[in-house]
C-alpha cells in the first residue's frame, strides 16, 4: 500500500511539475504536507534555473550532477539521495518526509553511521571479553595476546609460554624463572645478568656513584664508608654520610686569662726573659688549678745555664728542685693540691731560702748559701718556662719528672713585675687559654688519639697474651672509636667503638675484629652527664663483657674464627691507640670517627695516663674534662 | 607522537577563495577509523566545526558551510586540504586541523592554528 | 552565537574545586552521550580532557571529570592549580550529524 502511494505522488510530481512548471500551492497538492513541500520547492526552483533554454550549456559545466530536468525534479524527494550515510557503517537508508533515517550495521552508531562503536570499552562486555588486549577497528574488534603469550582456540584467552621450558639453555649459566609473559635470568644479589655472555657479573656499585664519599667494592656488593675523621658517619640508609652530631654539649667556654699548661704535648708553652737591676730576687706568684699530680708547672734559669729553679707538681704535692754553683736541692711538701681547685702558690727567693707558700701559708721553706742567680754587669737576666724546660735540661735533673702538665694558671706575678706583657700575648693564642669550668678525667675533643705502647702477653698464662679494658665514658657524640689495637700491616685486629643506635638518643657499643663486627651491645644511654662504666676481657678463646645492664660471655659461630684473627695479630706486635685510629684505610673497621667525650681507661690492671703516652694530640686532656653544658635561664 | 601544522595565506581578499593545507607527521593520514578535520575560532573565541574527510574521500560538513567548502586529502604528502569560497569577512578566524577519533566526534590531536584575515 | 551555553568565567583558588556548565538541547547535550570537554591555553593547541560525557583520555589527571544531568554537561576540577588556568570548551555531537561547541569559559586561578 506504501510503495502504491509513492507511485502516485511520483506520477501527480511528473504530471504537475515536469511535464508542466508548478507553483508552490500545486507542489502541496502532490505531497500533501508542509515539510516536503517547504523542502522541495526551493530545490525545485533551482533544476528550473539550471534547465531553462538557452543554459544547459553552463548548467553542465555547474556542479549539477543531473543530465536532465526529468532527473533533477524527481531526485528532490528522496532524501538518501544522494547517501547521506556513511558506507562503511549503514545497513539501509529510509527516506522519511524531508528526512532520512540510516540503519547502521552492527559495530556503527550516529546519525549517519559515521562512528565506530569501541566494543572494547562496552561496560557490559568488559575489555570485549578479551583476556589481554582488545584492538578496536572501525565496525569490529579483535583481542590479541601480549608478548610471551600465545591466543587459545576461542580466539579471546592466552596461555603463557614456559620460556625456561622450552630452551633450557636460555640463560646460559644465570637461573631461569618463568614469569607471565617472559622469563628472567637471575642473578644472586650484587650480580648483574650479562645478555652477551649469558652469566652473571659482579656489579660495580662504586662506579655508579652509590656511596657519597668512599666506597668499596668487592664480588656480590659493596661498602660505604665516610671520613669519620673529618667528622662524618654513615646515615642509615648506609650510603649518605651525615655530620657526627653532638648528643651531650660541653662547656668549652675558655678565658684569656687563664694559662693553659698542655697546650703542646711535648714542649713549653710560654717563654719569658727577664732582665731586672741586681738588687731583684726571683719571686713568682701565681694561682694553679690541675687534676695532674705530676709535672712542670714553671723552670727558671740563668742566662749562661748554670743554675736553675724547676717549681713541679709530683703525687699532686709542690716539688722544687734547684741547683747553681753552691748548692742542689729537692724539696717537696705542702698538701696535695691536684684537687682542681684554684690554689694560690708562691716561690719568694729570700735572702737565705726560698719560701713556698700555698694560699699565703708557707708549706716549704729551702736553705740556700748565696743568691740563687748570679748578676752580671750590674743585671739579674733570668729565663722563665712555663709547663716545660729545655730538652738538654731533662739529664741535668736532680730526679726526673713526667715535665706534661695538664694545669692552668692565672693572677701570674713573676719577678714582681705583674703580668706584663704576657697577657697580650695570650690574649692572641686561643690554644693557650683555659677552660673556664673543668672535671677530673681525660678529655678526647673528636680530632685527635693517643698511642700507647703495651705489652699484652702473658708469660704465666696459658692463654699466651689476654686485654683486659675498664672504660669509665661520657661520650659527646654518639660515634667515635674508643680504643683500637693496630697491627704493623695496617689493619685493626681488635677495636671498641660508640655508634649512634638506630633507636632515638641511645648509643650501640660494636667489639669488631678488622671489619668485621663481633658483638654489638644496643641501645645504651651513653649520652648523659653521669660516666658509663665498661669492662671487656677478650683473650684467644673467650670475650667477656660487662656494662651497665649486664655481664656475660659472648659465643657465636663466627666468633671462634674472628678470636683467630685476633690471636695472630696478637702474637706479631701491636700499637695501643685511645680515641680513634691512625692512618689506616676506611675500610678497616666498621667506624673510623675519633672518639669526643670523656674517657679514662684502664687497661690489665693500669690506669692509663695519658702524660705517659708516645705521642698524644695536642687537643686531648690528658687530667681534665669540660663540664657538661648546663642551660641558663637566659642562654 | 601525531603532529599537526597548518599552512596557508594569513590574508585573503573577500569574495576569494581561503585555502588552506594541514601536514600530518608522526603517523599516517591512512590510519583505520581516523576523520581528518578542520574547525575554526571566531575573533571572539567561539569554535566553529567546519567538516571532515576519511582518507578514502568521504566527507562530512558543517550544513552552513556545505555550499561553499571542500575538503580533499592527499595521501601520497600525508597531507589534507580545505577550500573556503566567497570568503566575507566573517570568515576570519584562525583555523585548526584536527584528528578526530574513530569512535565520537572527539579531537584528539590538534594543529597550532593559523589566523586568516579575509580583508581587502 | 554558540549553540552550547557555558559562563564566560570561573575562577578559584588552589587547591579549591570548580565545575564549569554547559547547556544545550535534547537535539545535543541531551540526546546523545557524544559530549566533550577541550583546554585550551591560548597561543597552543587545542587538549582533549574529557569524551563520553566523563571518560578521561590517557595522560589526563585524574582531578578532571565530567557528568550530564538531562541537557546540562559538568566538568568539574578539583586540587585547582596554577596550570589550570585556560579557556575551556565543551562540545556535542547534533540531531543534524554536526559538532557543536560551547562560547568557551575562562578559569582564573587566584
Known amino acids: 500500500a506504501n510503495s502504491l502511494l509513492e507511485e502516485t505522488k511520483q506520477g501527480n510530481l511528473e504530471r504537475e511539475c515536469i511535464e508542466e512548471l508548478c507553483n508552490k500551492e500545486e507542489a502541496r497538492e502532490v505531497f500533501e504536507n508542509d515539510p516536503e513541500t517547504d523542502y522541495f520547492y526551493p530545490k525545485y526552483l533551482v533544476c528550473l534555473r539550471s534547465f531553462q533554454t538557452g543554459l544547459f550549456t553552463a548548467a553542465r559545466q555547474s556542479t549539477n550532477a543531473y543530465p536532465d530536468l526529468r532527473s533533477c525534479v524527481n531526485a528532490i524527494p528522496d532524501q538518501c539521495s544522494p547517501l547521506p550515510c556513511n558506507e562503511d557503517g549503514y545497513m539501509s537508508c529510509k527516506d522519511g518526509k524531508a528526512s532520512f533515517t540510516c540503519t547502521c550495521k552492527p559495530g556503527w552508531q550516529g546519525e549517519k553511521c559515521e562512528f565506530d562503536i569501541n566494543e572494547c570499552k562496552d561496560p557490559s562486555n568488559i575489555n570485549g571479553g578479551c583476556s589481554q588486549i582488545c584492538d578496536n577497528t572501525p565496525g569490529s574488534y579483535h583481542c590479541s595476546c601480549k608478548n610471551g603469550f600465545v591466543m587459545l582456540s576461542n580466539k579471546k584467552d592466552c596461555k603463557d609460554v614456559d620460556e625456561c621450558s622450552l630452551k633450557p639453555s636460555i640463560c646460559g649459566t644465570a637461573v631461569c624463572k618463568n614469569i607471565p609473559g617472559d622469563f628472567e635470568c637471575e642473578c644472586p644479589e650484587g650480580y648483574r645478568y650479562n645478555l652477551k655472555s649469558k652469566s652473571c657479573e659482579d656489579i660495580d656499585e662504586c662506579s655508579e656513584n652509590m656511596c657519597a664519599q668512599l666506597c668499596v667494592n668487592y664480588p656480590g656488593g659493596y661498602t660505604c664508608y665516610c671520613d669519620g675523621k673529618k667528622g662524618f658517619k654513615l646515615a642509615q640508609d648506609q650510603k649518605s654520610c651525615e655530620v657526627v652530631s653532638v648528643c651531650l654539649p660541653l662547656n668549652l667556654d675558655t678565658k684569656y686569662e687563664l694559662l693553659y699548661l698542655a697546650e703542646q704535648f711535648a714542649g713549653v708553652v710560654l717563654y719569658l726573659k727577664f732582665r731586672l737591676p741586681e738588687i731583684s730576687r726571683f719571686s713568682a706568684e701565681f694561682d694553679f688549678r690541675t687534676y695532674d699530680s705530676e709535672g712542670v708547672i714553671l723552670y727558671a734559669e740563668s742566662i749562661d745555664h748554670s743554675a736553675w729553679l724547676l717549681i713541679a707538681l709530683r703525687g699532686g704535692k709542690i716539688e722544687v728542685q734547684l741547683k747553681n754553683e753552691h748548692t742542689s736541692k729537692i724539696t717537696t711538701g705542702g698538701d696535695v693540691i691536684n684537687n682542681g681547685l684554684w690554689n694560690m702558690v708562691s716561690v719568694e727567693e729570700l735572702e737565705h731560702s726560698i719560701s713556698i707558700k700555698i694560699a699565703k701559708e708557707a708549706v716549704m721553706d729551702i736553705n740556700k748559701p748565696g743568691p740563687l742567680f748570679k748578676p752580671e754587669n750590674g743585671l739579674l737576666e733570668t729565663k722563665v718556662y712555663f709547663a716545660g724546660f729545655p730538652r738538654k735540661v731533662e739529664s741535668e735533673l736532680i730526679k726526673p719528672i713526667n715535665p706534661r702538665l695538664d694545669g692552668c694558671i692565672r693572677s701570674w706575678n713573676l719577678m714582681k713585675q705583674g703580668a706584663s706583657g704576657i697577657k697580650e700575648i695570650i690574649q692572641e693564642k686561643q690554644n693557650k687559654h683555659c677552660l673556664v669550668t673543668v672535671e677530673k678525667g681525660s678529655y678526647y675533643p673528636g680530632s685527635g688519639i693517643a698511642q700507647f705502647h703495651i705489652d699484652y702477653n702473658n708469660v704465666s698464662s696459658a692463654e699466651g697474651w689476654h686485654v683486659n679494658v675498664t672504660l669509665n665514658i661520657r661520650p659527646s657524640t654518639g660515634t667515635g672509636v674508643m680504643l683500637a689495637l693496630v697491627s704493623g700491616n695496617n689493619t685493626v685486629p681488635f677495636a671498641v667503638s660508640l655508634v649512634d643506635s638506630t633507636s632515638e638518643k641511645s648509643q650501640d657499643i660494636l667489639l669488631s675484629v678488622e671489619n668485621t663486627v663481633i658483638y654489638r651491645i644496643q641501645a645504651l644511654s651513653l649520652c648523659s652527664d653521669q660516666q658509663s662504666h665498661l669492662e671487656f676481657r677478650v683473650n684467644r678463646n673467650n670475650l667477656e663483657l660487662s656494662t651497665p645492664l649486664k655481664i656475660e660471655t659472648i659465643s657465636h659461630e663466627d666468633l671462634q674464627r674472628q678470636l683467630a684473627v685476633l690471636d695472630k695479630a696478637m702474637k706479631a706486635k701491636v700499637a695501643t691507640y685511645l680515641g680513634g685510629l691512625p692512618d689506616v684505610p676506611f675500610s678497616a673497621t666498621p667506624v673510623n670517627a675519633f672518639y669526643n667525650g670523656c674517657m679514662e681507661v684502664n687497661i690489665n690492671g693500669v690506669q692509663l695516663d695519658l702524660d705517659e703516652a708516645i705521642s698524644k694530640h695536642n687537643d686531648i686532656r690528658a687530667h681534665s674534662c669540660p663540664s657538661v653544658w648546663k642551660k641558663t635561664k637566659n642562654s | 607522537q601525531v603532529q599537526l601544522q597548518e599552512s596557508g595565506p594569513g590574508l585573503v581578499k573577500p569574495s576569494q577563495t581561503l585555502s588552506l593545507t594541514c601536514t600530518v607527521s608522526?603517523?599516517?593520514?591512512?590510519?583505520?577509523?581516523?576523520?581528518w578535520s578542520w574547525i575554526r575560532q571566531y575573533p571572539g573565541k567561539g569554535l566553529d566545526w567546519i567538516g571532515y574527510?576519511?582518507?578514502?574521500?568521504?566527507?562530512y560538513y558543517n550544513p552552513s558551510l556545505k555550499s561553499r567548502v571542500t575538503i580533499s586529502v592527499g595521501t601520497s604528502q600525508n597531507q589534507f586540504s580545505l577550500k573556503l569560497i566567497s570568503v566575507t569577512a566573517a570568515d576570519t578566524a584562525v583555523y585548526y586541523c584536527?584528528?578526530?577519533?574513530?569512535?565520537?566526534?572527539?579531537?584528539?590531536?590538534w594543529g597550532q592554528g593559523t589566523l586568516v584575515t579575509v580583508s581587502s | 552565537q554558540s549553540a552550547l551555553t557555558q559562563p564566560a568565567s570561573v575562577s578559584g583558588s588552589p587547591g579549591q574545586s570548580i565545575t564549569i556548565s554547559c547547556t544545550g538541547t535534547s537535539s545535543d547535550v541531551g540526546g546523545y552521550e557524544f559530549v566533550s570537554w577541550y583546554q585550551h591555553h591560548p597561543g597552543k593547541a587545542p587538549k582533549l580532557m574529557i569524551y563520553d560525557v566523563s571518560s578521561r583520555p590517557s595522560g589526563v589527571s585524574n582531578r578532571f571529570s565530567g557528568s550530564k544531568s538531562g541537557n546540562t554537561a559538568s566538568l568539574t576540577i578539583s586540587g585547582l592549580q596554577a596550570e589550570d588556568e585556560a579557556d575551556y570548551y565543551c562540545?556535542?555531537?547534533?540531531?543534524?550529524?554536526?559538532?557543536?561547541f560551547g562560547g568557551g569559559a575562562r578559569l582564573t586561578v587566584l
Open positions: 574527510i576519511y582518507y578514502t574521500g568521504n566527507t
Open positions: 562540545s556535542s555531537y547534533t540531531r543534524s550529524s554536526t559538532v557543536v
Open positions: 584536527a584528528r578526530r577519533l574513530s569512535t565520537g566526534p572527539y579531537f584528539d590531536y
Open positions: 608522526g603517523g599516517s593520514i591512512t590510519s583505520d577509523g581516523y576523520h
